[in-house]
Interface confidence: low
Amino acid sequence: EGICRNRVTNNVKDVTKLVANLPKDYMITLKYVPGMDVLPSHCWISEMVVQLSDSLTDLLDKFSNISEGLSNYSIIDKLVNIVDDLVECVKENSSKDLKKSFKSPEPRLFTPEEFFRIFNRSIDAFKDFVVASETSDCVVSSTLSPEKDSRVSVTKPFMLPPVA
Amino acid sequence: EGICRNRVTNNVKDVTKLVANLPKDYMITLKYVPGMDVLPSHCWISEMVVQLSDSLTDLLDKFSNISEGLSNYSIIDKLVNIVDDLVECVKENSSKDLKKSFKSPEPRLFTPEEFFRIFNRSIDAFKDFVVASETSDCVVSSTLSPEKDSRVSVTKPFMLPPVA
């Protein structure tokens, strides 16, 4: 079972509703971890959940808490709780299998669709997390073999491969 | 009863939910009718509903249509229908009591709270509309009747004379 997998709940299913309920041209700031698009998840996941937590907390502040039904506020609030749990879990496992990028995350603007694709991918990384056997694969190289990630475009590093 | 009053439905109540469900810092473009801030409603309402219709239609395009519950899409769709009804009503009454500004509306950016305050007040204007018995009060001018305007000086007329 992946590290922290038990912290991931079904609330993530609400993301689809949330994305549909946010303006398509609304921009969400996220400090994006360089290499997320080309490197294995253990290289960036510990940093990424911290940044997602910050961004989602900021996003939550942009909405009013209305009790009625599945509001954006209530969905984001659940997502914040999920990610905060993962942040705690990452701290507990930080000396084990999760690496920290030496490169500082860069603030970028993402549409809701792009942002929550990164979110979903990060959550999936916990579900599918496999213990790293070596550290060399956390170095970004321009000579990355096509077989390694044939779906990654290096011309637009912020465009992620589709999430399964 | 106010002109077009029968066209205004209770769907306006959804506005509160919609505003709470939009990011507070999201900016909505509206061509704001000059004079709305200083002149009575019958001077600008016919122009304003046309602009609100355009803005709401553009806003609708920013959301995905998800069938579940009261989504932003479904609420905005209802509001577009209300405003489009009022646009029709204005056309029917345009030669009667509603004035049209000479001055072109100016595109401005409004937060959701500000935008929907303008929307609500425009709807209220139809609910409370009283037939205009005179046209002079749609012009801010130092040549207005002395009883009303003996103490006022205008350096730059805010609006040109209204079109009948």
Partner: antibody
Framework: LVESGGGLVQPGGSLRLSCAAS????????MSWVRQAPGKGLEWVSA????????YYADSVKGRFTISRDNSKNTLYLQMNSLRAEDTAVYYC???????????WGQGTLVTVSS | QMTQSPSSLSASVGDRVTITCRAS??????LGWYQQKPGKAPKLLIY???SLQSGVPSRFSGSGSGTDFTLTISSLQPEDFATYYC?????????FGQGTKVEIK
């Protein structure tokens, strides 16, 4: 809305009042100055449209007072020249809402014109 | 010109209080009511003659159209002792009534 710039001035003198706005999109609202002489009622003095393109004055201050605004600084101004004793009052800046007349007011600043 | 009456009145907590405002010419519904306490700025209570401003207690109500308008406080509370002004905004210049002072009996 927070006013400043009031004080004691001699007849014929000048003062410039400022009103700093926050918490709303300043450029979207017409603004006014309203004054209140000691123990008296409210008197509208001047107004300016949201863009600053149009200005309005009561006849009692016409030619002596100038209203202006700097939307980049979210600030409203009232330049008062050739002041008279009858201009002594608390000066309020007020936001002019679309339907709600003056819905937000500053705390006021006292202008005293006396020799 | 706006004429308010009475200029002052004395009332007790729980009383129903009515203040009237008359315009010298028709102003439709373009009238607001304000409350002012000593040393404080005016506060908008009612706009468009009868619409309650957000955050204002429901004991305040407004009515009227044209030339005659009324502000009613259904059950006077201790914090309601103040001076009340009507103001109109049909066109320039904006004008206010002379005020009605509501005092404790």
């Amino acid at each position: 809305l927070v006013e400043s710039g009031g004080g004691l001035v001699q007849p014929g003198g000048s003062l410039r009042l400022s009103c700093a706005a926050s918490g709303f999109t300043f450029s979207s609202y017409a603004m006014s100055w309203v004054r209140q002489a000691p123990g008296k009622g409210l008197e509208w003095v001047s107004a300016i449209s949201g863009s600053g393109g149009s200005t309005y004055y009561a006849d009692s201050v016409k030619g002596r007072f100038t209203i202006s605004r700097d939307n980049s600084k979210n600030t409203l101004y009232l330049q008062m020249n050739s002041l008279r004793a009858e201009d002594t009052a608390v000066y309020y800046c007020a936001r002019r809402d679309f339907f709600a007349h003056f819905d937000v007011w500053g705390q006021g600043t006292l202008v005293t014109v006396s020799s | 010109q706006m004429t308010q009456s009475p200029s002052s009145l004395s009332a007790s907590v729980g009383d129903r209080v009515t203040i009237t405002c008359r315009a010298s010419q028709g102003i439709r519904g373009y009238l607001g009511w304000y409350q002012q306490k000593p040393g404080k700025a005016p506060k908008l209570l009612i706009y468009s003659a009868s619409s309650l401003q957000s955050g204002v207690p429901s004991r305040f109500s407004g009515s009227g159209s044209g030339t005659d308008f009324t502000l009613t406080i259904s059950s006077l509370q201790p914090e309601d002792f103040a001076t009340y002004y009507c103001g109109e905004w049909l066109s320039m210049p904006y004008t206010f009534g002379q005020g009605t002072k509501v005092e404790i009996k």
